[in-house]
């Protein structure tokens, strides 16, 4: 007789969970030499650990402790992007810039990027029918607590400038309940970091107006300000042309505004 | 792990100058506070002066106008300009930092081995 599982609204586990995370680790520790000491095996258990037997509604940042243990890392604290709505680009800034990191830059991030995971309470077993959804079933799920654990940590540990890429093509450029609107914001440190520098993405070819303008970046300068963090914003007219003048500074077309 | 390394220290006349420094070397995320403290023979260690990453100062009262603290971020270097020195700020000087090691993990205290500073009167 079939064991009776519970249907969460959201999609389930990745398929090949397990050997992709693993996969990941031992590729990123052969690109980062700093990283060479990481046991694979180690990590992988210690992800497990955190969601495998327990209810999938019922995941704390404890549960992930001993994960961050493993992935101990260090990156400058002046040298952090966040992002909102625009990963794509900001990834693709971050392999040229190469000294600038995002969370996904990090072991713990490369290892979770884009997938989903969850257990359930009481077997070994991972389901790979359904997890829980943030907002039809329950906020402190695998996905959502690991997240918000990581993305806590790497902004607190921000310093000096600070920059965040934000997608101007959206209705919120910036958006209050995103994971940098609701997490990463308020746990800047005003104590380390002086400057928030939003990049305000443009999508459309002809588009020159000042984004930096926007009601929302306005509300953005405002909760940063309270926060006794100075706040400056630019926009990136040409997203293709700001990626060929990271590459190539020295191109005569970027003098000009891009 | 982390090292701080102070200098700097060393004899010097009441009403002369000493210009003391701390490098903190290692695998550094960021340095948030870093500050100077003091501990003469047979008395408790006492903080002297501290200065933030932002450069947000803090003095103690028998130091102010005399001694003046800054740090280099870049260097990860605090420095301490001890001017109109006393025969009372004679101590072993104390460099301490609160270091972040680990992106995941919170920033710990650190200390340095200390400087002598006497001055004669």
């Known amino acids: 007789v079939p064991r009776w599982r519970q249907q969460w609204s959201g999609p389930g586990t990745t398929k090949r969970f397990p050997e992709t995370v693993l996969a990941r680790c031992v590729k990123y520790t052969e690109i980062h030499p700093e990283m060479r000491h990481v046991d694979c095996q180690s990590v992988w258990d210690a992800f497990k650990g955190a969601f495998i037997s327990k209810h999938p509604c019922n995941i704390t940042e404890e549960d992930y402790q001993p994960l961050m243990k493993l992935g101990t890392q260090t990156v400058p604290c002046n040298k952090i992007l966040l992002w909102s709505r625009i990963k794509d680009l900001a990834h693709q800034f971050t392999q040229v810039q190469r000294d600038m990191f995002t969370l996904e830059d990090t072991l713990l991030g490369y290892l979770a990027d884009d997938l989903t995971w969850c257990g359930e309470f009481n077997t070994s077993k991972i389901n790979y029918q359904s997890c829980p959804d943030w907002r039809k079933d329950c906020s402190n799920n695998p996905v959502s607590v690991f997240w918000k654990t990581v993305s806590r940590r790497f902004a607190e540990a921000a310093c000096d400038v600070v920059h965040v890429m934000l997608n101007g093509s959206r209705s919120k450029i910036f958006d209050k309940n995103s994971t940098f609107g609701s997490v990463e914001v308020h746990n800047l440190q005003p104590e380390k970091v002086q400057t928030l520098e939003a990049w305000v993405i443009h999508g459309g070819r002809e588009d020159s107006r000042d984004l930096c303008q926007d009601p929302t970046i306005k509300e953005l300068e405002s909760i940063i300000s309270k926060r006794n963090i100075q706040f400056s914003c630019k926009n990136i007219y040409r997203p293709d042309k700001f990626l060929q003048c990271v590459k190539n500074p020295e191109d005569s077309s970027c003098t000009s505004e891009i | 792990q982390v090292k701080l390394e102070e200098s700097g220290g060393g004899l010097v006349q009441a009403g002369g100058s000493l210009r003391l420094s701390c490098v903190a070397s290692?695998?550094?995320?960021?340095?948030?506070?870093m500050g100077w403290y003091r501990q003469a023979p047979g008395k408790q260690r006492e903080l002297v002066a501290t200065?933030?990453?932002?450069?947000?100062?803090n003095y103690t009262d028998s130091v102010k106008g005399r001694f003046t603290i800054s740090r280099d971020n870049a260097k990860n270097t605090v420095y301490l300009q001890m001017n109109s020195l006393k025969p009372e700020d004679t101590a072993v000087y104390y460099c301490?930092?609160?270091?972040?090691?680990?992106?995941?993990?919170?920033?710990?205290?650190?200390w340095g081995q200390g400087t002598q500073v006497t001055v004669a009167s």
């Open positions: 301490n930092a609160e270091v972040q090691l680990d992106i995941w993990a919170s920033a710990y205290d650190y």
């Open positions: 200065i933030t990453r932002r450069g947000r100062t």
């Open positions: 290692g695998t550094i995320v960021s340095i948030s506070t």
